[in-house]
């Protein structure tokens, strides 16, 4: 082993993750953002799409197991559907049962992501911090 | 660029993070991993260190900024040396001023970790959640 | 209601500027995006851009356009508009506004019904 | 840029036959895919989003399958009103992108 190596080795059990936008976090090949300012969730919705990115979408507590931990509560990219009841994320997919605890916190056609996978309905034009998420292949 | 934008930056590059242990989160490329098994403070140094890491060390606001919104308690790689009365970090280092307020929950000489940089002072043989990490280059 | 402004309507000399505008009724513009698409005779469908109809300014390009083209609207009249300049012959096309619904995959889910721009001396 | 492929670039058939038309993407796009169908002089109308989701009033003899790179538009019972040109979309990342369309003709 020369100590001018050609190659970076890595640990088996070590790897990269991403790619993701610069000062994001990275986990299990997603990439998430945490945003401070309180927006409504359309300028929510807005703010993740000028990135290329979508508000939070919760698809797998495994994958996902991240979330089980943050505080407060943030805007994600679930919407009520009237004309049929759903929810549904920005991607167009309906929410999967099981994986979101809904809770009606306000009338409303949008939802809050907070700790424990769960889900509180709010009114879309109430302003709140929220989670950008961009989904790595 | 912070995790908490108060504008919002649209990424010039994309960039990898890490490496990591498989699975870990990655960010400003530190690595970290919550468990959620009940340790005490010297089993939960012993499982980082088994991972080739350490527990948490807080060192800047400004690139861990993805701490303030923990939720819960965690052991951090903080302990109290009595014979001087400071806190120390793992590595030796002493802790900085201002980085985190530390609370007297508890007489002890271990720190857990609270969401906005706040540290719980505990007794060591307490069980709790804890916190590994990992520096890369 | 999608209307296309300059001398001869939708026709354009080479290297000319031409403006076209789109005026947004029957739903809140401030929760939307516009997006420009058009469509060559017998050709596929091409994106142009997009622009937020609400308070942020946040707009896209397709790489092609390579600053020949700038969006703009006017929130307070629901109205976007799509600046076309240094106009050549394959920009000949017709120019839809759409609305950009990002809760529906981003999908295009109402079209205007075109402006045809003719680019010819 | 992400490049749709759709397959076949026509198709003839009859009334009441089932048509399948494929779109392929040259990366993953998860399911941020979207179909429309365009009639002649006319400006192309949403189909279907989420790679699986009917548009308000589209009949159900449209579905829609596939997830990530490879995606399928069924018409299950061809009626006279769907012979058109129908053309899938990415939303997954700008640039959005078409596929060049699949023309539905009578046999």
């Known amino acids: 082993n020369s100590l001018f190596n050609q190659e970076v080795q890595i640990p088996l059990t070590e790897s990269y993750c991403g790619p993701c936008p610069k000062n994001w976090i990275c986990y299990k090949n997603n990439c998430y953002q945490f945003f401070d300012e309180s927006k409504n969730w359309y300028e929510s919705q807005a703010s993740c799409m000028s990135q290329n990115a979508s508000l939070l979408k919760v698809y797998s507590k495994e994958d996902q197991d991240l979330l089980k931990l943050v505080k407060s509560y943030h805007w994600m990219g679930l919407v009520h559907i009237p004309t049929n009841g759903s929810w549904q994320w920005e991607d167009g997919s309906i929410l999967s049962p099981n994986l979101l605890t809904i809770i009606e916190m306000q009338k409303g056609d949008c939802a809050l992501y907070a700790s424990s996978f769960k889900g509180y309905i709010e009114n879309c034009s109430t302003p709140n911090t929220y989670i950008c998420m961009q989904r790595t292949v | 660029n912070s995790l908490f934008n108060q504008e919002v930056q649209i990424p010039l590059t994309e960039s990898y993070c890490g490496p990591c242990p498989k699975n870990w989160i990655c960010y400003k490329n530190n690595c970290y991993q919550f468990f959620d098994e009940s340790k005490n403070w010297y089993e939960s140094q012993a499982s980082c260190m088994s991972q080739n890491a350490s527990l948490l060390k807080v060192y800047s606001k400004e690139d861990q900024d993805l701490l303030k919104l923990v939720k819960s308690y965690h052991w951090m790689g903080l302990v109290h040396i009595p014979t001087n009365g400071s806190w120390q970090w793992e590595d030796g280092s002493i802790l900085s001023p201002n980085l985190l307020t530390i609370i007297e929950m508890q007489k002890g000489d271990c720190a857990l970790y609270a969401s906005s940089f706040k540290g719980y002072i505990e007794n060591c043989s307490t069980p709790n959640t804890y916190i590994c990490m990992q520096r890369t280059v | 209601e999608q209307s296309g402004g300059g001398a001869g309507g939708g026709l354009v000399k080479p290297g000319g500027s031409l403006e076209l505008c789109c005026k947004a009724s029957g739903f809140d513009f401030s929760i939307y995006w516009m997006s420009w698409v058009r469509q060559s005779p017998g050709k596929g469908l091409e994106w142009i851009g997009r622009?937020?109809?609400?308070?942020?300014?946040?707009?896209a390009y397709a790489s092609w356009v390579n600053g020949r083209f700038t969006l703009s609207r006017d929130i307070d009249q629901s109205t976007g508009c799509l600046q076309l300049n240094s106009l050549t012959a394959a920009d000949t096309a017709m120019y839809y506004c759409?609305?950009?619904?990002?809760?529906?995959?981003?999908?295009?889910?109402?079209w205007g019904q075109g402006t045809l721009v003719t680019v010819s001396s | 840029d992400i490049q749709m492929t759709q397959s076949p670039s026509s198709v003839s058939a009859s009334v009441g036959d089932r048509v399948t038309i494929t779109c392929r993407a040259s990366q993953g796009i998860f399911s941020w895919l979207v179909w429309y169908q365009q009639k002649p002089g006319k400006a192309p109308e949403l189909l279907m989003y989420g790679a699986s989701t009917l548009q308000s009033g589209v009949p159900s003899r449209f579905s829609g399958s596939g997830s990530g790179t490879d995606f399928t538009l069924t018409i299950s019972s061809l009626q006279p009103e769907d012979f058109a040109t129908y053309y899938c979309q990415q939303g997954y990342s700008t640039p959005y992108t078409f596929g060049q369309g699949t023309k539905v003709e009578i046999k």
């Open positions: 622009i937020y109809g609400g308070s942020s300014d946040y707009t």
């Open positions: 759409v609305r950009l619904n990002p809760s529906f995959s981003r999908s295009f889910d109402y």
